[in-house]
């Protein structure tokens, strides 16, 4: 008789989870000379345990927290882009830009990148038909949980001047619902945070708005003035000829408005 | 801007103690946990203790629990590390750095711990 399984409203873990988690952290620290000493089979087993035998809503900070220790790692904190809804470019300039970094630069990013995963309460099974929707389901699911806790801490390690890149071609070029606009945004400490630049990446070959005059982006700067901290917004309008520009910045046709 | 200076370190026998300082300026110090991290020749990065702003709340890897102890005084805006029972393998640069990790950048140069006999 088959046994009774919870059924979620999400997509269940992705196939081979544990392979794949254990594959990238190898990868991470063959690339990353500093990482190398990274023990990957205590990192797998650190993951695991943030979520395995554990109910898929009630996952916590705290479980993840063994997972956070293995995953120690300098970080220029003056060196920091965050991204809302346009992971692609913030990844391909990160490439480029070799100094700067996303949270997917970072080893505990680049394990969970685009990936999903949970349990069931009192088995040590993973789920592979269905997890939790933060929306229909529970916001304390052991996705949601982690994105929230390692992007709290990242925002947190950030200094100086920040970096932001926003995608000019949504209807809210600022969400305040999104991960950036929720937890990295309320997490900047002002006494370390001098300015956060945004950049605005326009979508439409013609677009020469200026986006940085946006109700939403307009929210963002009244947002973080008050909590102290400076607001600068750049307009991006050819993000093809930007990331150009950032491989060869001597170009002649590199000192024009991008 | 935030600025740390460690001090403290030096060379010790096994099982001696040392104790490390880190005075912290251009900043809320009560504010804002702080932990000590370390940096072993030829290796990464390790978390070694986090201490809550208030000191209310205090973790330790597990490599060290029971022989290390964080404690801050935030009217002199200094962080420590009482290091009891020292180790060979607990050589390394010790920094303090604010938050709780796991992604640090440490401002400070960091002071050497040695254990050897």
């Known amino acids: 008789v088959p046994r009774w399984r919870q059924q979620w409203s999400g997509p269940g873990t992705t196939k081979r989870f544990p392979e794949t988690v254990l594959a990238r952290c190898v990868k991470y620290t063959e690339i990353h000379p500093e990482m190398r000493h990274v023990d990957c089979q205590s990192v797998w087993d650190a993951f695991k345990g943030a979520f395995i035998s554990k109910h898929p809503c009630n996952i916590t900070e705290e479980d993840y927290q063994p997972l956070m220790k293995l995953g120690t790692q300098t970080v220029p904190c003056n060196k920091i882009l965050l991204w809302s809804r346009i992971k692609d470019l913030a990844h391909q300039f990160t490439q480029v830009q070799r100094d700067m970094f996303t949270l997917e630069d970072t080893l505990l990013g680049y394990l969970a990148d685009d990936l999903t995963w949970c349990g069931e309460f009192n088995t040590s099974k993973i789920n592979y038909q269905s997890c939790p929707d933060w929306r229909k389901d529970c916001s304390n699911n052991p996705v949601s949980v982690f994105w929230k806790t390692v992007s709290r801490r990242f925002a947190e390690a950030a200094c100086d001047v920040v970096h932001v890149m926003l995608n000019g071609s949504r209807s809210k070029i600022f969400d305040k619902n999104s991960t950036f606009g929720s937890v990295e945004v309320h997490n900047l400490q002002p006494e370390k945070v001098q300015t956060l630049e945004a950049w605005v990446i326009h979508g439409g070959r013609e677009d020469s708005r200026d986006l940085c005059q946006d109700p939403t982006i307009k929210e963002l700067e009244s947002i973080i003035s008050k909590r102290n901290i400076q607001f600068s917004c750049k307009n991006i309008y050819r993000p093809d000829k930007f990331l150009q520009c950032v491989k060869n910045p001597e170009d002649s046709s590199c000192t024009s408005e991008i | 801007e935030v600025q740390v200076l460690e001090s403290g370190g030096g060379l010790v026998q096994p099982g001696g103690s040392l104790r490390l300082s880190c005075a912290a300026s251009?900043?809320?110090?009560?504010?804002?946990?702080m932990s000590w991290v370390r940096q072993a020749p030829g290796k990464g990065l390790e978390w070694v203790s986090s201490?809550?702003?208030?000191?209310?709340?205090?973790d330790y890897a597990d490599s060290v629990r029971g022989r290390f102890t964080i404690s801050r005084d935030n009217s002199n805006n200094t962080l420590y590390l009482q290091m009891n029972s020292l180790r060979a393998e607990d050589t390394a640069v010790y920094y303090c750095?604010?938050?709780?990790?796991?992604?640090?950048?440490?401002r400070g140069q960091g002071t050497l711990v040695t254990v050897s006999s």
């Open positions: 750095a604010d938050g709780t990790g796991p992604f640090f950048d440490y």
């Open positions: 251009g900043f809320t110090f009560s504010n804002y946990a």
């Open positions: 201490i809550s702003g208030s000191a209310g709340s205090i």
